[in-house]
Structure formats: structure tokens, C-alpha cells
């Protein structure tokens, strides 16, 4: 798998969507992990609900939120209040027992906001590798705003 590069502004939210084959990954939980070094282990940040039928409910660890639309085959990760320390290499994973299959590798880059408190929503463009497999990004234009996905109320 090649790596998808996504850029977000410090202090804002970054939304990553990893698509997958819904039938192939039926019944499997998903996870978002941070890779420690190029060949190092991937440290779990957050995983979807322990009950697969409730995978669409948001699960949070700190400022990272995950939710999985298992019927559409899209797992969405939101990194809220992006900080410089959030930059790095991540993976979307599909969990099967103790094994984890990589759905997408994502390199998160954090940009300092040159306009400080002004809207910088149009100042960046996500870069996609040639083997782009569905990771997408949505960048909120107002600070700490997050797109609700999917509805839970």
C-alpha cells in the first residue's frame, strides 16, 4: 500500500475516510493506529465499538474519534484540535482476531495557520498517491467544529 498524504491546519479538525470492501470486512472491527517509525509497530489510538452492530456509534480516545459505516464500507476518523504533535504516519486497520489488515496508510501533516485566527479553509490541498484507495479528508472551516457521522440522535 502506498501512503496518502493529508494536511490539516493546527487547531482545526481533520477528517479521514477510509473505504473498504464491506462484504470482505463484514463483522470486523476497525482501528486507527499510529506507526512508530517506518518499520516499527502501529500503536492503537482508537477502535470502533466492541459490538460490531454498533460500529456506527462514535468512539473517542482523547481528541480522536472513530465511527464505521459498515454497510457503506467507510470508516471515518476525526482528529480534533489538530496539534503539531499529531503529525505522523497512521493506519486504518480492519481487525480479525489478533490480526490487523491495513486498509490505508495515511501521513498526517500539520500546517501552522498563517492567518492565525482567520479562516484558512482554502489554503491547503490534500495530496493523493497514485494508488489512492479511498482515504479522503474534510477540513472544517471553523475551529473545533466536527462533521457528525453518522447520526446517533
Amino acid at each position: 500500500l502506498n501512503t496518502t498524504v493529508l494536511q490539516g491546519m493546527a487547531g482545526q479538525s481533520l477528517r479521514v475516510s477510509c473505504t473498504y470492501d464491506a462484504l470482505k470486512h463484514w463483522g470486523r472491527r476497525k482501528a486507527w493506529c499510529r506507526q512508530l517509525g517506518e518499520e516499527g509497530p502501529c500503536q492503537r489510538v482508537v477502535s470502533t465499538h466492541g459490538v460490531w452492530l454498533l460500529a456506527f456509534l462514535k468512539k473517542r480516545n482523547g481528541s480522536t474519534v472513530i465511527a464505521d459505516d459498515t454497510l457503506a464500507g467507510t470508516v471515518t476518523i476525526t482528529l480534533k484540535n489538530l496539534q503539531a504533535g499529531d503529525a505522523g504516519l497512521y493506519q486504518c486497520q480492519s481487525l480479525r482476531g489478533r490480526e490487523a489488515e491495513v486498509l490505508q496508510k495515511v501521513l498526517v501533516e500539520v500546517l501552522e495557520d498563517p492567518l492565525d485566527d482567520q479562516d484558512a479553509g482554502d489554503l491547503w490541498v490534500p495530496e493523493e498517491s497514485s494508488s489512492f484507495e479511498g482515504a479522503q479528508v474534510e477540513h472544517s472551516t471553523s475551529r473545533n467544529q466536527e462533521t457528525s457521522f453518522p447520526p446517533t440522535s
Epitope: 463484514w26 463483522g27 466492541g50 459490538v51 456506527f56 456509534l57 454497510l71 453518522p150 446517533t152 440522535s153
Partner: antibody, heavy 126, light 106 residues
Framework: EVQLVESGGGLVQPGRSLRLSCTAS????????MSWFRQAPGKGLEWVGF??????????EYTASVKGRFTISRDGSKSIAYLQMNSLKTEDTAVYYC?????????????????WGQGTMVTVSS | DIQMTQSPSSLSASVGDRVTITCQAS??????LNWYQQKPGKAPKLLIY???NLETGVPSRFSGSGSGTDFTFTISSLQPEDIATYYC????????FGGGTKVEIK
């Protein structure tokens, strides 16, 4: 009228099997996650397991204490959910309820259970 | 597993009183909490879902609030027909109920 009616309870010896039925009416059965709960005499409520809607291919989930012994299934043509209970233990003695999960849309629901049956008593004793 | 601690286990109040029941989760459960009413010999009835949403057809004297680990269920003016046991139920981990609160009339 939206309704759930359980049946099949009774007295059974330890180690034996029993199948409970939950007959639904008044709503589109296939569109809803169905769940089973139980309540031992004088005790609180305990979730047993649930079965997903048709969209989720009737995927099942169970509480740890019944996993491998109990099986939930559904028959959309009859609007019935079943709870097959094998290797019954005395601690399985309880009133068993079926309930419907609250739905937001075709794909999304919440495990708030908005319609319940009247319950059926299962007594496991020698 | 998440433990749900409901208190008090029982209470006695007069008609018209404001009644408050609390439910504490052993870890953060966001707003993934429901409240039910169960009358003797009857099935539970959903009153509040997602911590604060009133179920259709439920009287407005019932309300719920809270998020994270601490949740509150309130009956603003107790009525004779409210005599029942009330349960909270979380769904952040699996499906776990609190121990129940038995409400009686003085």
C-alpha cells in the same frame, strides 16, 4: 398496533434445551434489530443478545455468559425472532423478554429498546 | 466491562415531589445511556434515550441529563402512576443495566 408476544417458556431440566419465540406485529419486522433480555426473580435486567436487521444480514451478538449456548435467529416471512437455549443451567432461570431496537433510519439504530413483549418465564430445575 | 452504579436503590417520596435518580458509569460513556421504567409484573418501558431525549408518548415530567460518567434522571412532579423501578442502561461497551431504583409513595 405495534406488538411483541413471547412464547415457549416453561420448566426444563438442567442441561436440556428450550426454544423461545417472539412474534412481532404492527411494524416491518425485517427493518429492526431484535433483542432478548432476561430478569431473574427479584433481580435486575440483563441483556442476552441481539440480531441485526435484514440490512445487517441478521448478524448476532451475545453477552459472554450465554455465548456458545444460546442462538438468536429470525424468520422474516413469519415476523418471528427465536432464542434457542441449549445446555441450560439453573442460573438461566428468569423471565425472558424480547424487545425491538429503536431505529433512526434504514441503516442506523440505537440500542434503546422501544417495544417490549410481556415476557415468558423459563425455570431450569431438576 | 463498564459498571453502572445507580443510586439510591430505593426512595420514598410524596405525590408532587421532585424525584432525582443518578447513574454513574465506571468510565466515560459519552451520552450512550437510556432510562427505563418497569412496573411490577410488567415489561420495561423506554422513557429516555441517548441520555436526554424523551421517548415519544412519555410525559414531559420525565427528563434525563448528563454525559461522560454522571447521569441524572428526574421526575419533576411525582404521580401515583410513577410507582415503579427505574433502570439506566449503557451501550458504550455492551448493553449493561444499573441495579435499579425502586420508587414508592410516602
Amino acid at each position: 398496533e405495534v406488538q411483541l408476544v413471547e412464547s415457549g417458556g416453561g420448566l426444563v431440566q438442567p442441561g436440556r434445551s428450550l426454544r423461545l419465540s417472539c412474534t412481532a406485529s404492527g411494524f416491518t419486522f425485517d427493518d429492526y434489530t431484535m433483542s432478548w433480555f432476561r430478569q431473574a426473580p427479584g433481580k435486575g435486567l440483563e441483556w442476552v443478545g441481539f440480531i441485526g436487521s435484514k440490512a445487517y444480514s441478521a448478524t448476532t451478538e451475545y453477552t459472554a455468559s450465554v455465548k456458545g449456548r444460546f442462538t438468536i435467529s429470525r424468520d422474516g416471512s413469519k415476523s418471528i425472532a427465536y432464542l434457542q437455549m441449549n445446555s441450560l443451567k439453573t442460573e438461566d432461570t428468569a423471565v425472558y423478554y424480547c424487545a425491538r431496537g429503536k431505529r433512526y433510519s434504514y441503516t442506523y439504530w440505537t440500542p434503546a429498546f422501544d417495544v417490549w413483549g410481556q415476557g415468558t418465564m423459563v425455570t431450569v430445575s431438576s | 466491562d463498564i459498571q453502572m452504579t445507580q443510586s439510591p436503590s430505593s426512595l420514598s417520596a410524596s405525590v408532587g415531589d421532585r424525584v432525582t435518580i443518578t447513574c454513574q458509569a465506571s468510565q466515560d460513556i459519552t451520552n450512550y445511556l437510556n432510562w427505563y421504567q418497569q412496573k411490577p409484573g410488567k415489561a420495561p418501558k423506554l422513557l429516555i434515550y441517548d441520555a436526554s431525549n424523551l421517548e415519544t408518548g412519555v410525559p414531559s415530567r420525565f427528563s434525563g441529563s448528563g454525559s461522560g460518567t454522571d447521569f441524572t434522571f428526574t421526575i419533576s412532579s411525582l404521580q401515583p402512576e410513577d410507582i415503579a423501578t427505574y433502570y439506566c442502561q449503557e451501550y458504550d461497551s455492551y448493553i449493561t443495566f444499573g441495579g435499579g431504583t425502586k420508587v414508592e409513595i410516602k
